[in-house]
């Protein structure tokens, strides 16, 4: 039975040209995290594997940095980076947990962070 929950940074906004940290946290389970995949819509951005470490998509090699922790840092943001991001936690023995973050990249200099929310 899957008892865990994923807490994410929720709906967030950031300025064009700036950077943002995408964070998820898995709680309420003793399952072992074997790998975390970060995806943007259907595109794989990065993988953090317990054995193999971090591997970043060549398409994002200059704009994506691993961490902090199991999070992901997006740099040199453009308006095209607006959209849904998913953290996919592969765990044993529970299986897969998915968290969703919506990022809006703003032209303006005012970028408010949204509240945290949980996905069971």
């Amino acid at each position: 039975m899957m008892t865990g929950t994923i807490e994410t940074t929720g709906n967030i906004s950031a300025e064009k040209g700036g950077s943002i940290i995408l964070q998820c946290h898995l709680s309420s389970t003793t399952a072992q995290v074997t790998q975390v995949n970060w995806e943007q819509q259907d595109q794989l951005l990065a993988i953090c594997n317990a054995d193999l470490g971090w591997h970043i998509s060549p398409s994002f090699k200059d704009r994506v940095a691993p961490g902090p922790g199991l999070g992901l840092t997006l740099q040199s943001l453009t308006v095209n980076d607006t959209g849904e991001y998913f953290c996919i936690y592969h765990t044993y023995p529970d299986g897969t947990y998915t968290g969703r973050i919506f990022l809006e990249v703003l032209e303006s200099s005012v970028a408010e962070h949204g509240a945290r929310f949980q996905i069971p």
């Epitope: 074997t34 794989l44 398409s59």
Partner: antibody
């Protein structure tokens, strides 16, 4: 035209090491991951690990950890796979394979293979 | 590790036959599955990626389908050059793993 050209067949004694090379051409070498996959005679395919020529980042299948090392020479667009402490079960054809453009974990081009025979 | 169980391990078919090969993953791999063709003494060649996307230059008689744990490679009308061994591969989770292969032989 993308080409991956591997070094020639090797015969090694148990306990020895082997170093197989894979020279890439026809594309931007640092834009794609390279993987190593082996195939024992008459058997299936086994993934050994990957290396990213852009930053020399590596990741190894835990089955081979401590015995395998993957390296890159960007000046010659060549990747190397060295396997230590050889045993008879390591007799196989070793392939380098380029990671795909949309996801680096499937293989769109393969080298011709290098037969490594381990025999006393 | 994710096990990819491929079936059948071999099959005999005639030119013009419709051939179906299946691959079952031991856990959900979404659509991160590729299919390869390998002829004796040769390197594998990519046929399908993302479960159903035909790779450049691959004839349209080859098609892939499935998601989650169950995947299928179909050859709609077998041609003489299609007699070979076919492998599936999952690429959701490291270590990357392959099915055991299906050898397609001439009946």
């Amino acid at each position: 035209e993308v080409q991956l050209v591997q070094s020639g067949a090797e015969v090694k004694k148990p306990g020895a090491s082997v170093k197989v090379s894979c020279k890439a051409s026809g594309y931007t070498f640092t834009d794609y991951y390279m993987h190593w996959v082996r195939q024992a005679p008459g058997q299936g395919l086994e993934w050994m690990g990957l290396v990213y020529p852009y930053n020399d980042n590596t990741g190894y299948n835990r089955k081979f950890k401590g015995r395998v090392t993957m390296t890159v020479d960007t000046s010659t667009s060549t990747v190397y796979m060295e396997l230590n402490s050889l045993r008879s079960e390591d007799t196989a054809v070793y392939y380098c394979a380029r990671g795909g453009p949309s996801n680096w974990n499937y293989f769109d081009y393969w080298g011709q293979g290098t037969l490594v025979t381990v025999s006393s | 590790d994710i096990q990819m169980t491929q079936s059948p391990s071999s099959l005999s078919a005639s030119v013009g036959d419709r051939v179906t090969i299946t691959c079952k993953a031991s856990q959900n791999v979404v659509t991160a599955v590729a299919w390869y063709q390998q002829k004796p003494g040769k390197s594998p060649k990519l046929l399908i990626y993302s479960a159903s996307n035909r790779y450049t230059g691959v004839p349209d008689r080859f098609s892939g389908s499935g998601s989650g744990t169950d995947f299928t490679l179909t050859i709609s009308s077998l041609q003489p050059e299609d007699f070979a061994t076919y492998f599936c591969q999952q690429y959701t989770l490291y270590p990357l793993t392959f099915g055991g292969g299906t050898k397609v032989e001439i009946k």
